[in-house]
Interface confidence: medium
């Protein structure tokens, strides 16, 4: 078993002989390079001292000395295998080979996890050169260890195109546990059954998991990481959490609120945006949604009339945009308006209603049974009608508004006239003899022209011609009465 | 098909321990807890214990603590109960149990049991 | 620790008929798992997390309740359903106790 900041197999000499395992202070190196971007200079060397046999890449030299012995295969030394340590703590370690001095273009590099470490890292490399061999340290240090270190570091030296890769130093950097996964905050059916995630890692492993509901536990005895609590349903809002045990101590996730969800609040600030004859433009603020989301809203119309049947209107929108225009009013009318919403569990109650009233229209009918004659002695048209129903007229009859058309051969003339509210009469002079004149009348109110009636149509004759009976607006189906006297 | 296989009938002598066990086949051995429970003739189950063995993680039912031990070797996809001191009390036929669900799931129910052991203690 | 009262202790049903068993907890209990023994035999799960039907136990067995109290239905009697039925509670607690059983015959 490995403990904390322990080695795995202690390291062997450095350098048997001569070089003994923990270097002496008169052994100054010749030279201490920062390895900053995997780069070592060229060297010369001398043979060098016989290590101990070895598990990684070997270069065997062709080249002989002058005495042609053969010279011994290259190998990095033996290290530590496996350093565990905890989080933010320092570490520092090597690789150490010894190189003939006949050797030259030697570089050393760094690789973590099969990518070479450039750029920023603490890494040095030192030589100590003797008379055939030259010593090189290569020195790996990080200040403060993160998970991101967690791995399997190697040395690479290439000589005359060999590659001597040393055996791996495996890093181990252990913590508190590490959430990957934390339970997350929902909105929930009351009573229903729902599931809650919570997933840490170290190292160390293994990872307990003990659920909390409301600060209290919820499983006394731990669950292995990842662990997924099915809550069978509840009845009121509950904060839940996860704790994370391993053999370093406890990490709590984040406590997620877990809401029931519930009818929403009735909207509040219903208000009046526009109002128009025959429209009312209302918006309102919503209510909390019951942690559900909105679907659709519901507006009440009802008649603020005591005297009308009470009978409610309704209008169905969507939720968005908290706007909707109320058609199909009577004009001149108050209204109550009352707005409710629903998300999937219900209606929420009505909001506060509120008092709103339509504007004057225009009269939405012409008056009735418009009737015209001829008056030849006093060489006028009587026009005589009924004003319309008063629910129709939208509004207060401020007048009427005539229209007569004079028509004769290549002549065509359209006259209006305008005449208080009080007349169901009216009398206009013969503007053309031996002519036709269509008459049409529209009621007026303050919010506007309402539309003419048929077209009635009366010959007028030639001076002389005997006075005889009236035009009148038409049965219905009858679309162009001409009366010819 | 999930399997438990338990090792056969064992008559022991008062005071004597003995070790019983169940091994599993045909899912992952090592990320489910092993739980074992106990059925005296003619009475209901108790609950003695489990044991996670991935890790040799055990929990106990407070009236087995002293009386079951529990291990498991990931090799051999087996787990183990050790019972001590033996009583007549302690005759019975025991049972592993694999936790159901998704090994994650924290609820507790068992989804496959083995046949049983029978254990009679007798002098 | 939790004790769950199963009822009745024994019970005897016609084929075809429905047949209803009960477990009491004295406590609630988050959910509760239904077992089928027969002489000789291991335990059987039958209901898992108070409603859910384990794998190839057939439709006429069905699991409800919550808080304190919990129900095995078993909607039409079959000769084969003679056995003794056991209910598991898992809750905030160990251990994860037993009923006493309730024993079911054939009439």
């Known amino acids: 078993a490995i403990t904390e900041a322990r080695e795995e197999a202690k390291p062997y000499p450095l350098f048997p002989g001569p070089f003994p395992g923990s270097l002496q202070t008169d052994h100054t190196p010749l030279l201490s390079l920062p390895h900053a971007s995997g780069y070592q200079p060229a060297l010369m060397f001398s043979p060098t001292q016989p290590g101990r046999p070895h598990t990684g890449n070997v270069a065997i030299p062709q080249v002989t000395s002058v005495e042609s012995k053969p010279l011994p295969p290259l190998a990095f030394k033996h290290t530590v295998g496996h350093i565990i340590l905890s989080e933010h703590k320092g570490v520092k370690f090597n690789c150490s080979i010894s190189v003939p001095n006949i050797y030259q273009d030697t570089t050393i590099s760094w690789w973590k996890d099969g990518k070479e470490l450039l750029g920023a890292h603490h890494a040095i490399t030192q030589f100590y050169p003797d008379d055939e061999v030259t010593a090189i340290i290569a020195s790996f240090s990080i200040t403060s260890v993160q998970r991101s270190d967690n791995g399997s570091y190697i040395c690479k030296m290439k000589i005359n195109n060999e590659e001597i890769v040393s055996d791996p130093i495996y890093i181990e950097v252990q913590g508190l546990p590490h959430f990957t996964k934390q339970p997350e905050s929902m909105n929930v059916t009351r009573n229903t059954a729902f599931n809650l995630t919570c997933q840490a890692v170290g190292p160390p492993e293994p990872v307990n998991i003990f659920w909390v509901q409301n600060s209290s536990r919820v499983n006394e005895q731990p669950e292995k990481s990842p662990s997924v609590l099915t809550v069978p349903g509840l009845t009121e809002m509950a904060v839940f959490s996860c704790e994370a045990h391993n053999d370093k101590g406890l990490t709590v996730s984040k406590g997620v609120q877990i809401n029931i969800k519930a009818i929403p609040s009735p909207p509040t600030e219903v208000s009046i945006r526009n109002s128009t004859a025959h429209s009312i433009l209302i918006s309102w603020v919503p209510g909390f949604d019951g942690y559900s989301p909105f679907r659709n809203c519901s507006i009440q119309v009802k008649e603020a009339d005591p005297l009308s049947n009470g009978s409610v209107m309704i209008f169905n929108t969507s939720a968005l945009p908290h706007l909707y225009q109320i058609k199909q009013l009577q004009a001149l009318a108050n209204y109550s308006i009352g707005v409710s919403c629903m998300n999937e569990i219900g209606w929420s109650a009505v909001s506060p209603w509120i008092l709103a009233s339509t504007t004057e229209g225009a009269p939405s009918v012409a008056p009735l049974n418009v009737t015209v004659f001829l008056n030849e002695s006093s060489d006028n048209v009587d026009i005589r009608w009924m004003k319309p129903p008063t629910k129709q007229q939208d509004g207060e009859l401020v007048g009427y508004r005539i229209s007569h058309v004079w028509q004769s051969a290549g002549i065509s003339k359209e006259l209006l006239e305008e005449v208080g509210q009080n007349g169901s009469r009216a009398r206009i002079s013969v503007q053309v003899h031996n002519a036709t004149c269509t008459v049409r009348i529209a009621a007026v109110t303050r919010g506007g022209v309402g539309p003419f009636s048929d077209p009635v149509k009366i010959f007028i004759p030639a001076h002389g011609w005997v006075d005889y009976a009236p035009s009148s607006t038409p049965a219905p189906g009858n679309a162009d009465p001409v009366l010819i006297i | 098909q999930v399997q438990l296989q338990q090792s056969g009938p064992e008559l022991v002598k008062p005071g004597a321990s003995v070790k019983i066990s169940c091994k599993a086949s045909d899912y992952e051995f090592s990320r489910s807890w092993m739980n074992w429970v106990k059925q005296r003739p003619g009475k209901g189950l108790e609950w003695i214990g489990r044991?996670?063995?991935?890790?040799?993680?055990?929990n106990y039912n407070g009236k087995f603590k002293g009386k079951a031990t529990l291990t498991a070797d990931k090799s051999s996809n087996t787990a183990y109960m050790q019972l001590n001191s033996l009583t007549s009390e302690d005759s019975a036929v025991y049972f592993c149990?694999?936790?159901?669900?998704?090994?994650?799931?924290?609820?507790?129910?068992?989804?496959?049991w083995g046949q049983g052991t029978t254990l009679t203690v007798s002098s | 620790q939790i004790v769950l009262t199963q009822s009745p202790a024994i019970m005897s049903a016609s084929p075809g008929v429905k047949v209803t068993m009960t477990c009491s907890a004295s406590s609630s209990v988050s959910y509760m798992h239904w077992y089928q023994q027969k002489p000789g035999s291991s335990p059987r799960l039958l209901i898992y997390?108070?409603?859910n039907l384990a794998s190839g136990v057939p439709v006429r067995f069905s699991g409800s309740g919550s808080g304190t109290s919990y129900s095995l239905t078993i909607s039409r009697m079959e000769a084969e359903d003679a056995a003794t039925y056991y209910c598991?509670?898992?809750?905030?607690?160990?251990?994860?106790?037993f009923g006493g059983g309730t024993k079911l015959e054939i009439k």
């Open positions: 997390d108070t409603s």
């Open positions: 149990a694999r936790k159901g669900g998704y090994y994650y799931s924290i609820s507790n129910y068992f989804d496959y």
């Open positions: 044991i996670y063995p991935g890790d040799g993680d055990t």
């Open positions: 598991q509670q898992w809750s905030s607690y160990p251990p994860y106790t």
